[in-house]
Amino acid sequence: MMTGTIETTGNISAKKGGSVILQCHLSSTMAQVTQVNWEQHDHSLLAIRNAELGWHIYPAFKDRVAPGPGLGLTLQSLTMNDTGEYFCTYHTYPDGTYRGRIFLEVLESSVAEHSARFQIP
């Protein structure tokens, strides 16, 4: 039975040209995380972190995506096109699969604040 919940950073905003941390956290389960997939709104994969193989960053994002902190992802050199939904998919053992959603808004304004409050989607 799947008892866990995915907490995410929810809706966040960051400055164009800046960086942002995408973070999900699996709680309320003893399940082991075997793999975490990070993908964009159009289903394209950004990065994968496998418990036994480590990180794999997709070639198209190699210059702008850094693994971590933890199972999270750091997106750098943000452009307006980075605005949209991001998803973390947690493959766990023995529970199964959990999925979380983050919405990132990239702002032109220099007053953009990066909010990183954890939310349960």
Epitope: Q32, T34, Q35, E39, H43, L45, I48, N50, A51, E52, L53, H56, F87, T89, H91, Y93, P94, G96, T97, R99
Partner: antibody
């Protein structure tokens, strides 16, 4: 060249046991997840078991859970499937397959070994 | 358990035609799907993984797509070597179920 060679298939009576082996070569076995898939006489493909690269995680469908055990010996580059309490519906060609890194699709398959469960 | 409904079960087509095979998942599997080809007397071979990624060495006339929970394999300008059986397989919730298969025959 990647090679997967299955062995151990046989004719066995219902309730019996059998152990299949799959010898792997041509790649770094210890860094790949591996699976067993069977093809029934009516040509349907059925996933049987999966084991992670290090052997820490094993997965089974309900149809074989508790009866079949997948294991691996990374020092010997060999994958195993221990089958017990065999039923007539387990009759099939059994393939071992390598999984794509970071994905679960199977990119290399062996030629298969035949298992017949009949009295 | 997630069910994969593959259609059609069989298809009779001519060389040069374009064919689309579909698999519908009973719930969202978020692109965790592969397509395989199997020729008579041979082992299956992967064509597409992660719904849209062409496996190494697979001709560009093959393509995978997704619309919601429906996944499609399209083969443009069928060649004689493309005839055989095709299967989809999902990878979600620690289960890896196959579709029922599609047999592609020469008309």
């Amino acid at each position: 060249e990647v090679q997967l060679v299955e062995s151990g298939g046989d004719l066995v009576k219902p309730g019996g046991s059998l152990k299949l082996s799959c010898a792997a070569s041509g790649f770094t076995f210890s860094t790949y997840g591996m699976s067993w898939v069977r093809q029934t006489p009516d040509k349907r493909l059925e996933w049987v078991a999966t084991i992670s690269s290090g052997g820490s995680y094993t997965y089974y469908p309900d149809s074989v859970k508790g009866r079949f055990t997948i294991s691996r010996d990374n020092a010997k580059n060999t994958l195993y499937l221990q089958m017990s309490s065999l039923k007539s519906e387990d009759t099939a060609m059994y393939y071992c397959a390598r999984q794509v890194h970071y994905f679960y699709a199977m990119d290399y398959w062996g030629q298969g070994t035949s298992v017949t469960v009949s009295s | 358990d997630i069910q994969m409904t593959q259609s059609p079960a069989s298809l009779s087509v001519s060389v040069g035609e374009t064919v689309t095979i579909t698999c519908r998942a009973s719930e969202n599997i978020y692109s965790n799907l592969a397509w395989y080809q199997q020729k008579q007397g041979k082992s299956p071979q992967v064509l597409v993984y992660a719904a849209t990624n062409l496996a190494d060495g697979v001709p560009s006339r093959f393509s995978g797509s997704r619309s919601g929970t429906q996944y499609s394999l399209k083969i443009n300008s069928l060649q004689s070597e493309d005839f055989g059986s095709y299967y989809c397989q999902h990878f979600w919730d620690n289960a890896y179920t196959f579709g029922g298969g599609t047999k592609l025959e020469i008309k």
